[in-house]
């Protein structure tokens, strides 16, 4: 779109996936587009088909290998190109020199579980998924708890400024249903962003003992 606005945003999950979104004002929904990935120092290249996710937005995942394989490093540069079909030919729409470890978004944490629950507190643990060993302990987390009668957006954020894959929630109300979510972010990368929120974990605090506050 010469006078419209387009946007090409990609993130590396730190292992073997680059997820991309291409949006363009005024583009037709049935436009056929692809993302081509050409690393500067690897023998492989990869392509994915952009599929519509909204009115003028398309997304795809460049699968670089098995989920836990380390396909890129901090010194790699991957040239990403958006190509769209115009009649019988392919037209280059956008190009980005992509630095994977400057554009990180990890997978959502998984395996959330209640380790221990009491009347006023609950200990929860989780695991990170497909995260590079390069980070060592240089990760941070945000967590939030959904209380009855509130929305996720109203839930205060709890920040864990270290690689700590558990939390002890306190000052909870007895015999009450809650939900819990967590997300992760590496400390590295100028354009790095938070992972998606984990699937919510539902739990219930224990009822207060009879005859006690």
């Amino acid at each position: 779109a010469v006078n419209g606005t387009s946007r090409f945003t990609c993130f590396y999950n730190s292992r073997a996936n680059i997820s991309c979104v291409w949006s363009q004002d005024g583009a037709l929904q049935d436009t056929s587009c692809q993302v081509h990935a050409w690393p500067d120092r690897r023998r492989w290249n990869q392509t994915c088909e952009l599929l519509p996710v909204s009115q003028a937005s398309w997304a795809c995942n460049l699968i670089l290998g098995t989920p836990d394989s380390q396909k890129l490093t901090a010194v790699d540069i991957v040239t990403l190109r958006v190509m769209c079909r115009e009649g019988v030919r392919w037209r280059m729409m956008a190009i980005q020199d992509f630095k994977p470890f400057e554009n990180l978004r990890l997978m959502a944490p998984i395996s959330l579980q209640v380790v221990h629950v009491e009347t006023h507190r609950c200990n929860i643990s989780w695991k990170i998924s497909q995260a590079s060993h390069y980070f060592e302990r240089h990760l941070e987390f945000e967590a939030r708890t959904l209380s009855p009668g509130h929305t996720w957006e109203e839930a205060p954020l709890m920040t864990l400024k270290q690689k700590q894959e558990w939390i002890c929630l306190e000052t909870l109300t007895p015999d009450t249903q809650y939900e819990f979510q967590v997300r992760v972010k590496p400390l590295q990368g100028e354009f790095t962003t938070w992972s998606p929120w984990s699937q919510p974990l539902a739990f219930r605090t224990k009822p207060a003992a009879l005859g006690k506050d």
Epitope: A1, S6, I95, D97
Partner: nanobody, 123 residues
């Protein structure tokens, strides 16, 4: 914040050549690839060419493909537009612009603009 300064414009005869320069400055300039645009009197600004700093990947407008070449010198943080086989219809004010990470043909995708340098092609 990215600053861009164009130079090299002038008066040239049809069929002649000219090289425009765009000097870029600012923090982490490699994150801001550069494009050239032009605006003729009474016309809308149009895309000419663009280049990324790291790989040197390029995009061109169909109207200049084969006549204009965009290049960059990373050591000097400068992008060049070599224009040859110039035509009177290439007469315009030529701007360089910088975009965050991605080059496209859309002027709205470029956040930083120079003041422009005038190119006049006489017949």
């Amino acid at each position: 914040e990215v600053q861009l300064v164009e130079s090299g414009g002038g008066l040239v005869q049809a069929g002649g050549s000219l090289r425009l320069s765009c000097a870029a400055s600012g923090r982490a300039i490699e994150n801001y690839p550069v494009g050239w645009f032009r605006q003729a009197p009474g016309k809308e600004r149009e895309f000419v060419a663009a280049i990324t700093w790291i790989s040197g990947s390029t995009l061109y407008a169909d109207s200049v493909k084969g006549r204009f070449t965009i290049s960059r010198d990373n050591a000097k943080n400068t992008v060049y537009l070599q224009m040859s086989s110039l035509k009177p219809e290439d007469t315009a004010l030529y701007y360089c612009a910088a975009a965050l990470k991605t080059i496209t043909r859309g002027q709205n995708d470029y956040s930083y603009w120079g003041q422009g340098t005038q190119v006049t092609v006489s017949s």
